[in-house]
């Protein structure tokens, strides 16, 4: 079952799947000036049996200059064509990740592929968030999102993360500031109670969080 939407957008954060569930599709997109080869695959598909998963189909790009058409490549399948980019980071697979049953690893790059990858995720997929460089992560909990099926509809859970500029000091309650030294926090340091005004802007994006962010500590 394909997830209807993209994972949640967290300002100043990118997300990444460490592994892709069987059924995931990756659009065969080419960079500017290139197009899919004639009769080439529209997408790669993560498929497998009980012991092994792999990507079916290969994406291939060729120079647009070889034909007099500059027709745009549309993401497929048809009903998914409005999907936004879901892979903003380098497609390199983290070296330490164990392979998971029923999951494919990051597909290797293909020649002249587009700079951003468009995935179509399936129910049960988990993605992980990181703040972009120059922004600090404030955690209420895990920086992850899972596509789940509820009452016949798919939805993504809300990552419990806010990315704030280095100079800003807003915090989630129950969260301590980053450690300045390996010696541990000073005994006098206490959790900062967040008020609504501190968080006016950030709360809008965190409004759908499944846990209240205005308690002084974990209940």
């Amino acid at each position: 079952e394909l997830c209807d939407d993209d994972p949640p957008e967290i300002p100043h954060a990118t997300f990444k799947a460490m592994a892709y569930k069987e059924g995931t599709m990756l659009n065969c997109e080419c960079k500017r000036g290139f197009r899919r080869i004639k009769s080439g695959s529209l997408y790669m598909l993560c498929t497998g049996n009980s012991s092994h998963s792999s990507w079916d189909n290969q994406c291939q790009c060729t120079s647009s200059a070889t034909r007099n058409t500059t027709k745009q490549v549309t993401p497929q399948p048809e009903e998914q064509k409005e999907r936004k980019t879901t892979e903003m980071q380098s497609p390199m697979q983290p070296v330490d990740q164990a392979s998971l049953p029923g999951h494919c690893r990051e597909p290797p790059p293909w020649e002249n592929e587009a700079t951003e990858r468009i995935y179509h995720f399936v129910v049960g997929q988990m993605v992980y968030y990181q703040c972009v460089q120059g922004y600090r992560a404030l955690h209420r909990g895990p920086a992850e999102s899972v596509c789940k099926m509820t009452h016949g509809k798919t939805r993504w859970t809300q990552p419990q993360l806010i990315c704030t500029g280095e100079m800003e000091t807003s915090q989630f309650p129950g969260e301590e500031k980053p450690q300045a030294s390996p010696e541990g926090r000073p005994e006098s340091e206490t959790s900062c109670l967040v008020t609504t005004t501190d968080f006016q802007i950030q709360t809008e994006m965190a409004a759908t969080m499944e846990t209240s962010i205005f308690t002084t500590e974990y209940q």
Epitope: K16, M18, P94, D96, Q97, A98, G124, M126, V127, Y128, Y129, Q130, C131, R136, A137, L138, H139, R140, G141, P142, A143, E144, V146, K148, T157, L161, Q171, G174, E175, E176, K177, P178, Q179, R185, E210, T211, Y218, Q219
Partner: antibody, heavy 119, light 106 residues
Framework: QVQLKESGPGLVAPSQSLSITCTVS????????IQWVRQPPGKGLEWLGV???????NYNSALMSRLSISKDNSKSQVFLKMNSLQTDDTAMYYC?????????????WGQGTLVTVSS | QIVLSQSPAILSASPGEKVTMTCRAS?????MHWYQQKPGSSPKPWIF???NLASGVPARFSGSGSGTSYSLTINRVEAEDADTYYC?????????FGGGTKLEIK
């Protein structure tokens, strides 16, 4: 290869403090959070706290007043410090890492270090 | 905090049987993780996000559930499955573990 290893004092006197070091290899602490979990003998698992990749921390509120987690990224070490130990703090203490970045599913665990609180 | 209640506390089964253990949450959670633990060893990752198997977990294991009720099922139980299984949530703070289900093989 991802590895985590706890090292602790073994025996701690009541009312004293506990310091445990978790030394990791195969990944960077700047990319992954480390969580601490303990298990009293013959009992279940209890989550203590986490230090995220960026250095911020969350604690179990029941232990927050006497618990501190810090790290040294360059040495690939995470430190757990707990004050005012009592006999019911006797447990196996584990450090663990999530599968993805600052995630929740603990895919990698240390072998644990047994801490006995006794006079 | 969300309390996870695992039942039964002890589950006895014969090889080849299908067994199911449940994990009930005191409030609704988004997804559940499961761990297997052998005596004297660290917990092992077993199932994540309700239904995804960890590396090395036999295909006879499966996970399902939603809301406040989740389960781990072993299709044809084997002697090597005799261990304690813990569920864990982090939909709400703090993350909590269930009390465990000890699986015994007759």
């Amino acid at each position: 290869q991802v590895q985590l290893k706890e090292s602790g004092p073994g025996l701690v006197a009541p009312s004293q403090s506990l310091s445990i070091t978790c030394t990791v290899s195969g990944f960077s602490l700047t990319s992954y959070g480390i969580q601490w979990v303990r298990q009293p003998p013959g009992k279940g698992l209890e989550w203590l706290g986490v230090i995220w990749a960026g250095g911020s921390t969350n604690y179990n509120s029941a232990l927050m007043s006497r618990l501190s987690i810090s790290k040294d990224n360059s040495k690939s070490q995470v430190f757990l410090k707990m004050n005012s130990l009592q006999t019911d703090d006797t447990a196996m203490y584990y450090c663990a890492r999530a599968y993805g970045y600052d995630g929740s599913w603990l895919a990698y665990w240390g072998q644990g270090t047994l801490v006995t609180v006794s006079s | 905090q969300i309390v996870l209640s695992q039942s039964p506390a002890i589950l006895s089964a014969s090889p080849g049987e299908k067994v199911t253990m449940t994990c009930r949450a005191s409030s609704s959670v988004s997804y559940m993780h499961w761990y297997q633990q052998k005596p004297g060893s660290s917990p092992k990752p077993w199932i994540f996000a309700t239904s995804n198997l960890a590396s090395g977990v036999p295909a006879r294991f499966s996970g399902s559930g939603s809301g406040t009720s989740y389960s781990l099922t072993i299709n044809r139980v084997e002697a090597e499955d005799a261990d304690t299984y813990y569920c864990q949530q982090w939909s709400s703070n703090p993350p909590t573990f269930g009390g465990g289900t000890k699986l015994e093989i007759k």
